[in-house]
Every structure is written in C-alpha cells, then in structure tokens.
C-alpha cells in the first residue's frame, strides 16, 4: 500500500527530484525577472535599493565550486522563506501604489510557496534536516511612505532575482555531480 500518509516517499532518483527543483527555480526566476521589469517600467528606480531585513546574498564568485547539496538546499529554503515573508508583507502593507501589481505579486507568492514545498520534499527525500532560520526574524513594520514601499519592492524583487540566479547555478552544477 506504500508508505503511511505524511511520511516522505523514498525517491529512487535524486537527480530527477533535483531536476524538478531546478526547473521550478528557473520558472520562478522568469516570473521574478518579469515582475522586476514591470516595477521598473511603472516606478523607475533611482539606483540600487536595499532592505536591512532581507537575507544577505548567499554567494560570491568563489563559492560555486565548493558547494554541497545539503548546504545549498538549506540556505535556499531559509532565504526563500524570508522572501516569502517579504512578499506577503508587500501585498499587505504596500499601499495603493502597489495595488496595481497585486495579481502579479499574488502569483509570485503562490510560486514561491510551491518551490518551498518542493524543496522541503526534496530535503526529506534526501534525509536532510529541515533547518530553522539561524537569524532572528525581524518584524516588518509598515513602510514609511508610498515611495518607501516602492523602494522596498525594488529591493525585494532585486534580491530574490539574485538569490534565484545563484540557486539555479548551484543546483545545475550539483546535478552534474550527482
């Protein structure tokens, strides 16, 4: 009858599971690119924007060669959980200026949640620990102004784009090593 409900199915092919995660990540990367471009068209950004509550970028030029699958999946999952919180916050507190992007932000949130579920499944199939975030969760207060929420949206989408680009690189390389 198969494994009991709720217990992970042991995968016969971790490459196929990882492949599926890569494709979902690329799909989310495409959505993020598109939404970031829409943001730039509607609300041109004056330079780079940052947000203290966002995770620091996980990568540097030298790190790809030494990546290990457990570390990549754990870090990616933790970072994506943070970005999910930020997207939820944007939808809730972004104000009228971001309301026009609500359908796209909603779709992005749904895809982020789907990728997180896939990563969780992959980690359980590979018997990796489901690590909790090692950083304290910073409460997200309301943006100081309409322009503040626009700057925050630029920062969130820009950071998510880089995180996903790094993730695709790392996962593609790891897949060739499996």
């Amino acid at each position: 009858p198969g494994p009991p409900a709720g217990s992970p199915r042991v995968s016969s092919d971790p490459r196929a599971d990882l492949d599926s995660a890569v494709l979902l990540t690329r799909s989310l990367l495409a959505d993020t690119r598109q939404l970031a471009a829409q943001m730039r068209d509607k609300f041109p950004a004056d330079g780079d924007h940052s947000l203290d509550s966002l995770p620091t970028l996980a990568m540097s030029a030298g790190t790809l060669g030494s990546l290990q699958l457990p570390g990549v999946l754990t870090r990616l999952r933790v970072d994506l959980m943070s970005y999910l919180r930020h997207v939820q916050w944007l939808r809730r507190a972004g104000g009228p200026s971001l309301k026009t992007l609500e359908p796209e932000l909603g779709a992005l949130q749904a895809r982020l949640e789907r990728l997180l579920r896939r990563l969780q499944l992959l980690m359980s199939r590979l018997a990796l620990p489901q690590a909790a975030p090692d950083q304290p969760v910073i409460p997200l207060g309301p943006p100081a102004s309409a322009w503040g929420s626009i700057r925050a949206a630029h920062a969130i989408l820009g950071g998510l784009h880089l995180t996903l680009d790094w993730a695709v690189r790392g996962l593609l390389l790891l897949k060739t090593r499996l």
């Epitope: 030029a61 880089l162 680009d165 690189r169 593609l172 897949k175």
Partner: antibody, heavy 119, light 111 residues
Framework: EVQLVQSGAEVKKPGASVKISCKAS????????MDWVKQAPGQRLEWIGD????????IYNQKFTGRATLTVDKSASTAYMELSSLRSEDTAVYYC????????????WGQGTTVTVSS | DIVLTQSPASLALSPGERATLSCRAS??????????IHWYQQKPGQAPRLLIY???NLESGVPARFSGSGSGTDFTLTISSLEEEDFATYYC?????????FGQGTKLEIK
C-alpha cells in the same frame, strides 16, 4: 541601441593564453548574464559558460572547465573570457552573447572575435 | 549532454516557397510549461541572430513569416514564404539543462 562590441582578432602560439573583451551598451549591464559561445570552422556552436555581472559565480561547460575563465568589470560594463593552454583546435570565432538563466536563450550577440592558434 | 539533430543538413528552395526545418532532441526538452528550444539564423561572416525563443515565441523585430512549433523532442521552424534575405544557416539550441547545446545547422540555399 543594445550592443555588444568585442575586441579584435588574435593570433596565438600553442600553450599561450588569450583574453577577449566584450563591452556592453544600451542596456543595464547587471540585468542580464553574459554567455560565451565558440564556433570552430565546420563545427556546431558550442556554449562555453555564463557569468552573472552582479555576483560573478560563473558556470562552465565541463569541456572548458579549468581552461576558460569568465570575469566581469561592472564599472566598465565589460565581460572577459580568458582561454589558457591554447591548442590548434581552439582556432575559432568566439562570441559573447546576452542571456539569462530562466530561459537561457541569447538575444544579443557580439560581432565575434577570431582566435587563430598556430605555431 | 542533450544532442540536437537538425534535418535536412541542407535545403534548396526558391523565393516564395515554404521552408520547413526540423530539430530533434535526444531527450525531452519540454517541462514545467516551457519548451526550452530556440532558433537562430546565421549569415556568413555574421553572428547568429535569435528568431524564435521557447519553441514558438517570435523575437522582437523578426518578420511574421517565421514561426516555431513542437514539444517534447520534435521541433519545427517554418518560413511561410521565403525572401532573398532568408537564405542562411539555421541553428536550434536547447536550454533544458547544463550545458545548453546547439544543433549542427540546416543550410538554406537558393535553388
């Protein structure tokens, strides 16, 4: 106008290295990755690797790992490809091309740099 | 690596005729709602030019006589009515996996 302009033709001896530049203009350099493609006479196009201008972190075709090195100079909107330990079969036209990892097609190409390896 | 095989290797047609170029992948390149196949045109002494991306999307500035179709392992580039400037070599490329690879090309010649 979106453009990628590459450095000029090179003639090198076997065992030497070559470094090709690719200057981007007409778009925000950090918004796209830069890919490199080889076209040897009578051979199919061959992808060499890809680099993200913001984070570096190049990925390579295993065939070129260890011999190709991709770098960027963000301030100059310029990407570089260095190929070391040159041999005769490296004689080819090398292209830089604008890409991204989501769909990974190349929508803007440089004019190509001819590298000839001959003793 | 995924191998792309293009056919025919060369094709001689006249202006005004319809051209059908094929690209077959050694494994499926369609998944998660995308078909990761792209088509390029290359003329002698020039860089490749993107025509079609993701199997069927026409790149900006490319004439509407070019179209792409297919899914899974079999893909087609169609030129509905050939113009003089269409005689060139055409390449397909996949981006399903690392590394992306190209087909060997189809040379379209004037009859």
């Amino acid at each position: 106008e979106v453009q990628l302009v590459q450095s000029g033709a090179e003639v090198k001896k076997p065992g030497a290295s070559v470094k090709i530049s690719c200057k981007a203009s007409g778009y925000i350099f950090r918004d796209y990755n830069m890919d490199w493609v080889k076209q040897a006479p009578g051979q199919r196009l061959e992808w060499i690797g890809d680099i993200n201008p913001t984070i570096g972190a190049p990925i390579y075709n295993q065939k070129f790992t260890g011999r190709a090195t991709l770098t960027v100079d963000k301030s100059a909107s310029t990407a570089y490809m260095e190929l070391s330990s040159l041999r005769s079969e490296d004689t080819a036209v090398y292209y830089c091309a604008r890409g991204e990892l989501a769909h990974w097609y190349f929508d803007v190409w440089g004019q190509g740099t001819t590298v000839t390896v001959s003793s | 690596d995924i191998v792309l095989t293009q056919s025919p290797a060369s094709l001689a047609l006249s202006p005004g005729e319809r051209a059908t170029l094929s690209c077959r992948a050694s494994k499926s390149v369609s998944t998660e709602g995308y078909s990761y196949i792209h088509w390029y045109q290359q003329k002698p002494g020039q860089a490749p030019r993107l025509l079609i991306y993701l199997a069927s999307n026409l790149e900006s500035g490319v004439p509407a006589r070019f179209s792409g179709s297919g899914s899974g392992t079999d893909f087609t580039l169609t030129i509905s009515s050939l113009e003089e400037e269409d005689f060139a070599t055409y390449y397909c490329q996949h981006s399903r996996d690392l590394p992306p690879t190209f087909g060997q090309g189809t040379k379209l010649e004037i009859k």
